[in-house]
């Protein structure tokens, strides 16, 4: 058993049929010695008396808010949560496996630039009685500071019969140099509590590997005389690291109709303009990627050909 | 310590081309190592990230773009002195700081070159003959060093009398390649910045 936060404790349980469970001793936070009784949650049934209460925790029915009283007055609470271990593996029931970029990916993180600011998000089908707490650091043995905000519900989607909820959190490395060469990864730890179930999820990454620039901005078209060719120009996104001559991007320019199966014109360039062939009912799209370290491409920025 | 904006005239910067080749060569070699050594811990997640130039050169700091010198987190206090004559400095306006930056890059390349050559000598003794260093990568390191054209003491190639542990050597190769790729990215960024300034 360990303390998650003040008056909240996590009991780690091997979860299998007829498991013996864990013996837990609760101590009432009071100077009183006599006349103390214990109850669980909203029940008035007295579970025991005395300053300490010893319980055998085997299942979710044994978890919950234990309260010690004296003469009708509440003295203190201890909330017990369960963390299940099945076949030596901690449970991952609360969050959905996003399976990208690989199986068992529960947390996904992205950074728009090298400033040390990043966003992580996760998915769940649970809508109520759910809380998250996020901590982060650079490295684990001698951790350097990363400050994370509160996790917030950022999107709701309907997937078949189910509703899916996306939560996200923003974090900022306390002293980040955009030009630095990372040797220690960022560690992100998410504590998830659903009702009386506790789970924790972690992710480890280098900022350079989670870079995904914003789409290029200010796409403009200039038809070329006596030609079907169009000069398309754009600018670096505002959120990208500066100076741009140091933090350079490369671009993919594509002309395509509404269907992905349609024919297309495609060209890659390091410049902020390109010449392509425009077709009726097609769109010109441009996306960006770090020129020197191939992490993710940005989303497309698009303008219609006509 | 930073790169000033008054740097060589555009198109006068022969090192840019070489640095692009360097990044390409080390990326290809790393990809080849990951594929060939698929049963070894050779991915970014599996290896320890070591920097053989740590406390010996200060490329990131010496080559910091002017715009980042306002960022406290970028200004480390490490100071190193370097030789200051180089052919990539294709303009008289070249500052001492830029010379410091380019000579730091030169020192990095020299250190990696020695490590890679020593390692290749060991890998050539491996009866499995599983992986060797790409000669193109070694040639590209050499080309960039020649373009930088700094005079410095030659570092003797390390020779070891004991029987090499090929498993350890291959893991060390992965560690070196990952670190060198990161440094090659920095070098490419620096050359691009200097070329544009």
């Amino acid at each position: 058993i360990w303390e998650l936060k003040k008056d909240v404790y996590v009991v780690e349980l091997d979860w299998y049929p007829d498991a013996p469970g864990e013996m837990v001793v609760l101590t009432c936070d009071t100077p009183e010695e006599d006349g103390i009784t214990w109850t669980l949650d909203q029940s008035s049934e007295v579970l025991g008396s005395g300053k300490t209460l010893t319980i055998q925790v085997k299942e979710f029915g044994d978890a919950g808010q234990y309260t010690c009283h004296k003469g009708g007055e509440v003295l203190s609470h201890s909330l017990l949560l369960l963390h299940k271990k099945e076949d030596g593996i901690w449970s991952t029931d609360i969050l959905k496996d996003q399976k990208e970029p690989k199986n068992k990916t529960f947390l996904r993180c992205e950074a728009k630039n090298y400033s040390g600011r990043f966003t992580c998000w996760w998915l769940t089908t649970i809508s109520t009685d759910l809380t998250f707490s996020v901590k982060s650091s650079r490295g684990s043995s001698d951790p350097q500071g990363v400050t994370c905000g509160a996790a917030t519900l950022s999107a709701e989607r309907v997937r078949g019969d189910n509703k899916e909820y996306e939560y996200s959190v923003e974090c900022q490395e306390d002293s980040a140099c955009p030009a630095a060469e990372e040797s220690l990864p960022i560690e992100v730890m998410v504590d998830a509590v659903h009702k009386l179930k506790y789970e924790n999820y972690t992710s480890s990454f280098f900022i350079r590997d989670i870079i995904k620039p914003d789409p290029p901005k200010n796409l403009q078209l200039k038809p070329l005389k006596n030609s079907r060719q169009v000069e398309v120009s754009w600018e670096y996104p505002d959120t990208w690291s500066t100076p741009h001559s140091y933090f350079s991007l490369t671009f993919c320019v594509q002309v395509q109709g509404k269907s992905k199966r349609e024919k297309k014109d495609r060209v890659f360039t390091d410049k902020t303009s390109a010449t392509v062939i425009c077709r009726k009912n097609a769109s010109i799209s441009v996306r960006a990627q770090d020129r020197y370290y191939s992490s993710s491409w940005s989303e497309w920025a698009s303008v219609p050909c006509s | 310590r930073n790169l000033p904006v008054a740097t060589p005239d555009p198109g006068m910067f022969p090192c840019l081309h070489h640095s692009q080749n360097l990044l390409r060569a080390v990326s290809n070699m790393l990809q080849k190592a990951r594929q060939t050594l698929e049963f070894y811990p050779c991915t970014s997640e599996e290896i320890d990230h070591e920097d053989i130039t740590k406390d010996k050169t200060s490329t990131v700091e010496a080559c910091l773009p002017l715009e980042l010198t306002k960022n406290e987190s970028c200004l480390n206090s490490r100071e190193t002195s370097f030789i200051t004559n180089g052919s990539c400095l294709a303009s008289r306006k070249t500052s001492f700081m830029m010379a410091l930056c380019l000579s730091s890059i030169y020192e990095d390349l020299k250190m990696y070159q020695v490590e890679f050559k020593t390692m290749n000598a060991k890998l050539l003794m491996d009866p499995k003959r599983q992986i060797f260093l790409d000669q193109n990568m070694l040639a590209v390191i050499d080309e960039l060093m020649q373009a930088l054209n700094f005079n410095s003491e030659t570092v003797p190639q390390k020779s070891s009398l004991e029987e090499p542990d090929f498993y350890k050597t291959k893991i060390k190769l992965c560690i070196l390649l990952h670190a060198f790729r990161i440094r090659a990215v920095t070098i490419d960024r620096v050359m691009s910045y200097l070329n544009a300034s």
Epitope: R228, Q229, T250, R261, E262, K263, K264, D265, R266, V267, F268, T269, D270, T275, I277, R279, K280 | -
Partner: antibody, heavy 118, light 107 residues
Framework: QVQLVQSGAEVKKPGSSVKVSCKAS????????LHWVRQAPGQGLEWMGW????????EYAPKFQGRVTITADESTSTAYMELSSLRSEDTAVYAC???????????WGQGTLVTVSS | DIVMTQSPLSLPVTPGEPASISCRAS??????LHWYQQKPGQQPRLLIA???QSISGVPSRFSGSGSGTDFTLTISSLQPEDFATYYC?????????FGQGTKVEIK
């Protein structure tokens, strides 16, 4: 299976014209760009131009501009390349090639040898 | 027009050995570079698109690398059926242009 079948070999006099056909099968004809590339005996490849069969848009290499005409007939899934004012140096194998991507070629015709000789 | 220069023009190789063909562009073309294989009496076959993207059905021993002006086609271990002429082609701008070809011959 996508296939491009070209017309047979031709022998032409200098100053005349030649029209080579390329019939596509497998896949929708207008879903692809169609190019013409030639190869003189023992020489390399030379791109001549492309057509978008969907709308008849064409683009020609400056070297052939004014001498080459590429057309397409959607009803028969056939593209044509006509080269006029033939000279002996136009002796080559002319091949059609297509792709959903405009700028490179993933399926080629078998080629048509055009010999220009007096 | 962008001029594509291949080297060497002839490459004698022992079967089972690796082979590398170089292609250089007269100006930067990013990764707009494609590789083809042509056997005598046959039309070219696409091997690699956009400098390094493998093509479905092409053996994995063929790989491409490069960007900007310098590109390489590598055959990791030459098989008897790989003896042919190889062409690079740029798609950075029109007119599309090819290298002059590299003939890979049996040593």
């Amino acid at each position: 299976q996508v296939q491009l079948v070209q017309s047979g070999a031709e022998v032409k006099k200098p100053g005349s014209s030649v029209k080579v056909s390329c019939k596509a099968s497998g896949g929708t004809f207008s879903d692809y760009y169609l190019h013409w590339v030639r190869q003189a005996p023992g020489q390399g490849l030379e791109w001549m131009g492309w057509i978008d069969p969907e709308n008849g848009d064409t683009e020609y290499a400056p070297k052939f501009q004014g001498r080459v005409t590429i057309t397409a007939d959607e009803s028969t899934s056939t593209a044509y390349m006509e080269l006029s004012s033939l000279r002996s140096e136009d002796t080559a194998v002319y091949a059609c090639a297509r792709n959903k991507e405009l700028r490179y070629f993933d399926v080629w015709g078998q080629g048509t040898l055009v010999t220009v000789s007096s | 027009d962008i001029v594509m220069t291949q080297s060497p023009l002839s490459l004698p190789v022992t079967p089972g050995e690796p082979a590398s063909i170089s292609c250089r562009a007269s100006q930067s073309i990013s990764i707009n570079l494609h590789w083809y294989q042509q056997k005598p009496g046959q039309q070219p076959r696409l091997l690699i698109a956009f400098a390094s993207q493998s093509i479905s059905g092409v053996p994995s021993r063929f790989s491409g690398s490069g960007s900007g002006t310098d590109f390489t086609l590598t055959i990791s271990s030459l098989q008897p059926e790989d003896f042919a002429t190889y062409y690079c082609q740029q798609s950075n701008s029109f007119p599309l242009t090819f290298g002059q070809g590299t003939k890979v011959e049996i040593k």
